[in-house]
């Protein structure tokens, strides 16, 4: 079995303020078991945007049904984009652990830029 890869195809996407932004992400394998999370930024100061396992993320919807057992698609849509949302977004796979899940592999990142709302 090949080791899982995290596919984030777009290096960058551009969205007008007020619109929704879709960020694509997929896995190439169901193994290892564990959740995915989306972050804005990298390193210790990164901001959690979505956690498959828990939490409330009112502006984020998933494109696919993440609860399905064989799901490989972890694309998200973020609603009502503002300039403050600009940044690089990472789709990150975690391996199930005890007591805490362990980061396993990250996508290459997608830079979101925000255009002024069309007048």
């Amino acid at each position: 079995e090949d080791e899982l890869q995290v596919i984030q195809p777009e290096k960058s996407v551009s969205v007008a303020a007020g619109e929704s932004a879709t960020l694509r992400c997929a896995m190439t394998s169901l193994i290892p078991v564990g959740p995915i999370m989306w972050f804005r930024g990298a390193g210790a100061g990164r901001e959690l945007i979505y956690n498959q396992k828990e939490g409330h993320f009112p502006r984020v919807t998933t494109v696919s049904e993440l609860t399905k057992r064989n799901n490989l698609d972890f694309s998200i849509s973020i609603s009502n984009i503002t300039p403050a949302d600009a940044g690089t977004y990472y789709c990150v796979k975690f391996r199930k652990g005890s007591p805490d899940d362990v980061e396993f592999k990250s996508g290459a990142g997608t830079e979101l830029s925000v255009r002024a709302k069309p007048s």
Partner: antibody
Framework: QLQLQESGPGLVKPSETLSLTCTVS??????????WGWIRQPPGKGLEWIGS???????YYNPSLKSRVTISVDTSKNQFSLKLSSVTAADTAVYYC?????????????????????WGRGTLVTVSS | EIVLTQSPGTLSLSPGERATLSCRAS???????LAWYQQKPGQAPRLLIY???SRATGIPDRFSGSGSGTDFTLTISRLEPEDFAVYYC?????????FGGGTKVEIK
Amino acid sequence: QLQLQESGPGLVKPSETLSLTCTVSGGSISSSSYYWGWIRQPPGKGLEWIGSISYSGSTYYNPSLKSRVTISVDTSKNQFSLKLSSVTAADTAVYYCARDPRDYSSGSSGGGWGYFDLWGRGTLVTVSS
Amino acid sequence: EIVLTQSPGTLSLSPGERATLSCRASQSVSSSYLAWYQQKPGQAPRLLIYGASSRATGIPDRFSGSGSGTDFTLTISRLEPEDFAVYYCQQDGNFPLTFGGGTKVEIK
């Protein structure tokens, strides 16, 4: 008018690598944010997506074939190519190249992984010794 | 992956009749991500419908698509002689994108 044309050997030996090229004419492969895909169809059977690539080289592949597939793009020649390694008789098929018209660089495109509005005529590749 | 099941496998009809083709998904697919293709012998597939109901450029209005969730339908209101072919549905709302097994529309 944009046209796609597949080319490459029609016969490949088992365990060798299948190599095909798709030439895009009537427009530049890099003038838009399209993705370009490969799809195959074994004789008398249905369609199977192999993988897709953008003009900038971003790729994604069908997980069932991923370990054997490489897709690359050469914008200077207006071509993209498919390599499928370690072929067996099960890889005998008509191979099509096609265009995915969605602009994924626009984050408001809504996502998805591709549909195909323009196809090449296809080329039959037989795997046999 | 999402499995698309098309039915019937073969549809035997006469020119002028209405054809109704079904595509059922193993899990829900957003209607934005469902397409239909027509394929004639020895030819490449041709895009008919995308986004479940939008006709592709140059497709006659006798072809229409509908549906949502797990059930989608392609309807040909009045079959013309050139419509006898194999029809495939395809989803790309979930990775990897997948095709149905096809429905052959043949002359009765």
